[in-house]
């Protein structure tokens, strides 16, 4: 069904999921339609993210289904917003020595975390595991992201950009194949193997101490063994 979803052939092929991982479990950061941010034990349509890299290690993170930017208030609370505020909705990305990624607000200094406590990022610190993230390519069939493409002839450019803030629905060239270091993909979600139904089930290994290929937040990150 090549044309089953209007999203096929668009940049939705570049969706990723950010997840925390301990030795036994993992939680995926998801941005709900109402702006609430929490973690899920598995990939969901609300944990599918677009991450745009900017200069000096800054990133902008958007939930593609909620159409909301990930933002942070002055107390360190994270939430999803339809409106992009450069002070609240840009995060500094840093890769720790263990290969895990942390994101913190340059404005308020708090770490993005799936834990409830708010902690400021300090260089050299060892954040708790629920503030350290790995990224994983989307394993959810694109048909599940079946939202209509904006009808541009009935909308102003302003309306259009609000519905599609990062232009994720505008067709573009397909992603190039992953480098060899990233080729250990999990089975596709159409596969009937146990891993396909649980691409990020319960993590076995502890913290990974090697850097893997990929330099930006969309590159391959080291990850523990999944069951």
């Amino acid at each position: 069904y090549p044309n089953a979803s209007p999203l096929l052939g668009s940049s939705w092929g570049g969706l990723i999921h950010l997840y925390t991982a301990t030795a036994r479990n993992s939680y995926h950061l998801q941005i709900h339609k109402n702006g609430h941010v929490d973690g899920a034990p598995h990939q969901t349509i609300y944990s599918a993210l677009m991450i745009r890299s900017e200069d000096a290690g800054f990133v902008v993170i958007t939930g593609v289904m909620s159409r909301r930017y990930l933002c942070m208030d002055f107390r360190g609370n994270i939430f999803g917003s339809h409106y992009f505020d450069p002070e609240n909705c840009r995060f500094q990305h840093q890769t720790l020595e263990n290969g895990y990624d942390v994101y913190h607000s340059p404005q308020y200094h708090f770490l993005v975390s799936l834990g409830r406590a708010k902690r400021a990022f300090l260089p050299g610190m060892n954040p708790p595991p629920y503030s350290q993230f790995l990224s994983r390519r989307n394993e959810i069939p694109l048909i599940h992201f079946n939202t209509p493409i904006p009808r541009r002839h009935t909308q102003s450019a302003e309306d259009d950009s609000e519905r599609d803030p990062l232009n994720v629905l505008k067709p573009r060239a397909r992603m190039t194949p992953a480098p060899a270091s990233c080729s250990q993909e999990l089975p596709s979600a159409e596969d009937n193997s146990p891993m396909a139904s649980d691409p990020l089930g319960v993590v076995r290994g502890g913290r990974v101490n090697t850097h893997a290929g990929g330099t930006g937040p969309e590159g391959c990150r080291p990850f523990a063994k999944f069951i």
Epitope: H42, R116, N126, G201
Partner: antibody, heavy 117, light 106 residues
């Protein structure tokens, strides 16, 4: 409100198996991992294992590998823990507990399992 | 696997006393430490998460501190309902519990 309701007390003979249930309500069952923790009489808490509620994937403490089986039924929002080859030292209260990323916030009331010949 | 040790294993105190319980991890666990209170015949109750954050509904006389390997639970003024056993638990790479500290009446 969140509730975890466990099955009733059990008395088993050595070598037998026991299956304890934990029915969750008041929240979206598939959004939280569930753990099993046990406590022998007069002793401390001992973590047994974890189950992913959506996939059924499990990970157990090394001590229980091969003896404990955790399953779930998403249609009834229930998790199960089966312990086989019971011995007297398995006499304990068994708890299920909900994971909220940084803590176990809700616990079942506990199920007393007595292993005696 | 990371091991947790608690001290003291038991202590006797009076109402109004300041009580301090320590929990030590065999290796660094950042702030991924939780404290629970358990009374006889009851399930554990969450008191502190992320080493120092007070769980909603828990009295402010309870506080937690520490990071890395050394952690402390403090009860600033012991109340009659606080006589119980207290457990620490780490969330860094597993879910290990400490052996517990029993607080009883002097």
């Amino acid at each position: 409100q969140v509730q975890l309701v466990q099955s009733g007390a059990e008395v088993k003979k050595p070598g037998a198996s026991v299956k304890v249930s934990c029915k969750a309500s008041g929240y979206t069952f598939t959004n939280h991992y569930m753990h099993w923790v046990r406590q022998a009489p007069g002793q401390g808490l001992e973590w047994m294992g974890i189950i992913n509620p959506i996939s059924g994937s499990t990970s157990n403490a090394q001590k229980f590998q091969g003896r404990v089986t955790m399953t779930r039924d998403t249609s009834t929002s229930t998790v199960y823990m089966e312990l086989s080859s019971l011995r007297s030292e398995d006499t304990a209260v068994y708890y299920c507990a909900r994971d909220i990323v940084d803590a176990f916030d809700f616990w079942g009331q506990g199920t007393m399992v007595t292993v005696s010949s | 696997a990371i091991q947790l040790t608690q001290s003291p294993s038991s202590l006797s105190a009076s109402v109004g006393d300041r009580v301090t319980i320590t929990c030590r991890a065999s290796q660094g666990i950042s702030s991924a430490l939780v404290w629970y209170q358990q009374k006889p015949g009851k399930a554990p109750k969450l008191l502190i998460y992320d080493a120092s954050s007070l769980e909603s509904g828990v009295p402010s006389r309870f506080s937690g501190s520490g990071s890395g390997t050394d952690f402390t639970l403090t009860i600033s003024s012991l109340q009659p309902e606080d006589f119980a056993t207290y457990y620490c638990q780490q969330f860094n790479d597993d879910f290990t519990f400490g052996p517990g500290t029993k607080v009883d009446i002097k």
